[in-house]
């Protein structure tokens, strides 16, 4: 008999290499037999994990699986670190492994801006 | 020295369709995404689409069905395409060039905008 | 959506008077913009991510806020700030703005 019992299927160690400035989605693999799970996402700061607050997301729902998604409109250098999702499934905290984001800034060293070039170039 | 200009047809009939064209100079189109704000005196301003460097797009989901955002890296341009225009289609029409810095993201440098106006 | 609401919608003030306007949104925020537009002009970005003057904005400018609740902050009217000032967020697709407030000057 299969279990019923909430699912996250992020494997151990994964990765991803993205680059800021453009968009990507973060998807958490969320297996669950009859009620949907309330599933969040939190970054690591140290040992502790901070919950996402105002951030985007959504689900995508497949035939055998669902995806609980983290939306980044667009990738900013802040994004780099690890994240984990975690599921409240009948007054149970489960918990995904973690998945790292490197984030790599397109913007590069000729083209980033001096101090002075950053504030007046939000004049039009 | 960062630039953006619109070129709009002004005046397009009911039914039609609209397509607007964004030429930018002073920065790469394949590093910083370009959006498409208008700008109505019924619904203020309007969030339409972007183009992400990378070349992915991202609509207002309530025009979306109507909207076709697409780009040209080497001519520096983009393109805005909406089908089915209406009389509230009525607005100046402004392409937007997006930057972020290390913790937020922000709409900088504004094109001097094109007026459309729905007519027959 | 999130829905940003904008008050006052016109608001008249004498130079040297402080301004504060506001801006809630109707579900919470990372950060918030502002834009200062005049007619036929397009807009211009004036504070971004809540705090932050854009260049040649004068220091009696200010903005402040979390969650749902900012505000931006003139310390002393002068006639040269007379403009529809928007706010925006960037925290959740559709990315809106408010419904202006009009600051005009006595």
């Known amino acids: 008999k299969e279990s019923c019992d909430v699912q996250l299927y992020i494997k151990r160690q994964s990765e991803h290499s993205i680059l800021a400035g453009d968009p990507f989605e973060l998807e958490c693999p969320v297996k669950y037999c009859a009620n949907r799970p309330h599933v969040t996402w939190c970054k690591l700061n140290g040992t502790t994990c901070v919950k996402l607050e105002d951030r985007q997301t959504s689900w995508k729902e497949e035939k055998n699986i669902s995806f609980f998604i983290l939306h980044f409109e667009p990738v900013l250098p802040n994004d780099n670190g690890s994240y984990r999702c975690s599921a409240n499934f009948q007054r149970n905290l489960i918990e995904s492994h973690s998945t790292t984001l490197y984030v790599t800034d397109v913007k590069s060293a000729s083209e980033r801006p001096s101090k002075d070039e950053m504030a007046s170039r939000f004049w039009a | 020295q960062v630039q953006l200009k619109e070129s709009g047809p002004g005046l397009v009939a009911p039914s039609q369709s609209l397509s607007i064209t964004c030429t930018v100079s002073?920065?790469?189109?394949?590093?910083?995404?370009v959006h498409w704000v208008r700008q109505s005196p019924g619904k203020g301003l309007e969030w339409l689409g972007v183009m992400w460097p990378g070349g992915r797009t991202s609509y207002n989901p309530a025009p979306m069905s109507r909207l076709s955002i697409s780009k040209d890296n080497s001519k520096s341009q983009v393109f805005l395409k909406m089908n089915s225009l209406q009389t509230d289609d009525t607005a100046m029409y402004y392409c937007?060039?997006?930057?972020?810095?290390?913790?937020?993201?922000?709409?900088?440098?504004w094109g001097q905008g094109t007026s459309v106006t729905v007519s027959s | 959506q999130i829905v940003l609401s904008q008050s006052p919608a016109i608001l008249s003030a004498s130079p040297g008077e402080k301004v504060t306007m506001t801006c809630r949104a109707s579900?919470?925020?990372?950060?918030m913009h502002w834009y200062q537009q005049k007619p036929g002009s397009s807009p211009k970005p004036w504070i971004y991510a809540t705090s932050n003057l854009a260049s040649g904005v004068p220091a009696r400018f200010s903005g402040s806020g979390s969650g749902t609740s900012y505000s931006l902050t003139i310390s002393r009217m002068e006639a040269e700030d007379a403009a529809t000032y928007y706010c925006h967020q960037w925290s959740s697709n559709p990315y809106t703005f408010g419904g202006g407030t009009k600051l005009e000057i006595k």
């Open positions: 002073g920065f790469s189109l394949t590093t910083y995404g």
């Open positions: 937007v060039r997006g930057d972020y810095e290390y913790d937020y993201y922000a709409m900088d440098y």
């Open positions: 579900s919470s925020v990372s950060y």
